[in-house]
């Protein structure tokens, strides 16, 4: 038995941070779970994870230099990346595991979100336009 | 309170096979990695392996992956750990440990040890 | 895999001194970085956790600091039972990785 998981097919990070909605079909209400945000195709990078148990206060972390943070919904986790850089670009995978009460259950690998991330842009003001061209 | 509680000492020749037993009580089982670290007489600590007891998911030390087997039985709560082809270098103390699966990253519970002495 | 290094090997110190330990990886591992004290015929006891987190019931005049590549343990006034050896471990990747120890003596 594993657990559905939608995202968003892309999402467009304009101010080098993006806000990525996971959504399962199970309710994480009292239960011990462990959902992560993972990098590339094969998944290689832990972005963030968010660990979550019935007598704890919710604990986010990333082990790889990710600015990152995580909210809690009943069937949702919302990872909040920050600082992303443009070669961060890249396809990242929802995993939730629920680790308590047993059996341990995961998910059904998702489609994964495209999250681009657009570099800032430095656009001259229009009350000091740049050099005219002869 | 929280325990690991390992299988006693053992002699063994070279290119026999050991397995050690480190059995968990005082905690949620399948809320923890068990780790497998080994001592040689006068020598650091080697991560050897771990094990995932709620998908039995394992990783391996490179240098023993084809000579180590983790396993669990979650029915008794009882992590193993067997080392094939034994050489004289092998002779040790094995230790089991956990962390936490869901923050994974230090060892905050050990066992007592296993003293495995390879010998002709 | 991260290499993890330990300096010194060894050294002599007395009851009240304050002793410091340090320990180097190869690569970045931020804050994932733990402490043990180990006593002869036993298992390592984990001190500091997240470089900087005094596990539950350890002393506090053990003080862990440092991220990325250099870490320091500090025990602020040696005392009887302090004398071990101590080990730096890192939990960044796997393999997780030990350093070499460093062994604690009476002068």
């Known amino acids: 038995n594993k657990i559905l998981v939608k995202q968003s097919p892309m999402l467009v990070a304009y101010d080098n941070a993006v806000n990525l909605s996971c959504k399962y079909s199970y309710n994480l209400f009292s239960r011990e779970f462990r959902a992560s945000l993972h990098k590339g195709l094969d998944s290689a990078v832990e972005v963030c994870v968010v660990y979550g148990n019935y007598s704890q206060q919710l604990q986010v972390y990333s082990k790889t230099g990710f600015n990152c943070d995580g909210k809690l919904g009943n069937e949702s986790v919302t990872f909040y990346l920050q600082n992303l850089y443009v070669n961060q670009t890249d396809i990242y995978f929802c995993k939730i595991e629920v680790m308590y009460p047993p059996p341990y259950l995961d998910n059904e690998k998702s489609n994964g979100t495209i999250i681009h991330v657009k570099g800032k842009h430095l656009c001259p003001s229009p009350l000091f336009p740049g050099p005219s061209k002869p | 309170q929280v325990q690991l509680v390992q299988s006693g000492a053992e002699v063994k020749k070279p290119g026999a096979s050991v397995k050690v037993s480190c059995k968990a009580s005082?905690?949620?089982?399948?809320?923890?990695?068990i780790h497998w670290v080994r001592q040689a007489p006068g020598q650091g600590l080697e991560w050897i392996g771990c094990?995932?007891?709620?998908?039995?998911?394992?990783n391996y030390n490179e240098k023993f992956k084809d000579r180590a087997t983790l396993t669990v039985d979650t029915s008794i709560s009882t992590a193993y750990m067997e080392l094939s082809r034994l050489r004289s270098d092998d002779t040790a103390v094995y230790f089991c440990?956990?962390?936490?699966?869901?923050?994974?990253?230090?060892?905050?519970?050990w066992g007592q040890g296993t003293t495995v002495t390879v010998s002709s | 895999d991260i290499q993890m290094t330990q300096s010194p090997s060894s050294l002599s110190a007395s009851v009240g001194d304050r002793v410091t330990i340090t320990c180097h990886a190869s690569?970045?591992?931020y804050v994932w970085l733990n402490w043990y004290q180990q006593k002869p015929g036993k298992a390592p006891k984990l001190?500091?956790?997240?470089?900087?987190n005094l596990h539950t019931g350890v002393p506090s005049r053990f003080s862990g600091s440092g991220s990325g590549t250099d870490f320091t343990l500090t025990i602020s006034s040696l005392q009887p039972e302090d004398f071990a050896t101590y080990y730096c471990?890192?939990?960044?990747?796997?393999?997780?990785t030990f350093c070499g120890g460093t062994k604690v003596e009476i002068k």
């Open positions: 471990q890192q939990g960044q990747t796997y393999p997780y």
């Open positions: 094990i995932y007891p709620g998908n039995v998911n394992t």
């Open positions: 690569q970045n591992i």
């Open positions: 440990t956990r962390s936490h699966y869901g923050l994974d990253w230090n060892f905050d519970v």
């Open positions: 005082g905690y949620t089982f399948t809320s923890y990695y």
């Open positions: 001190l500091i956790y997240k470089a900087s």
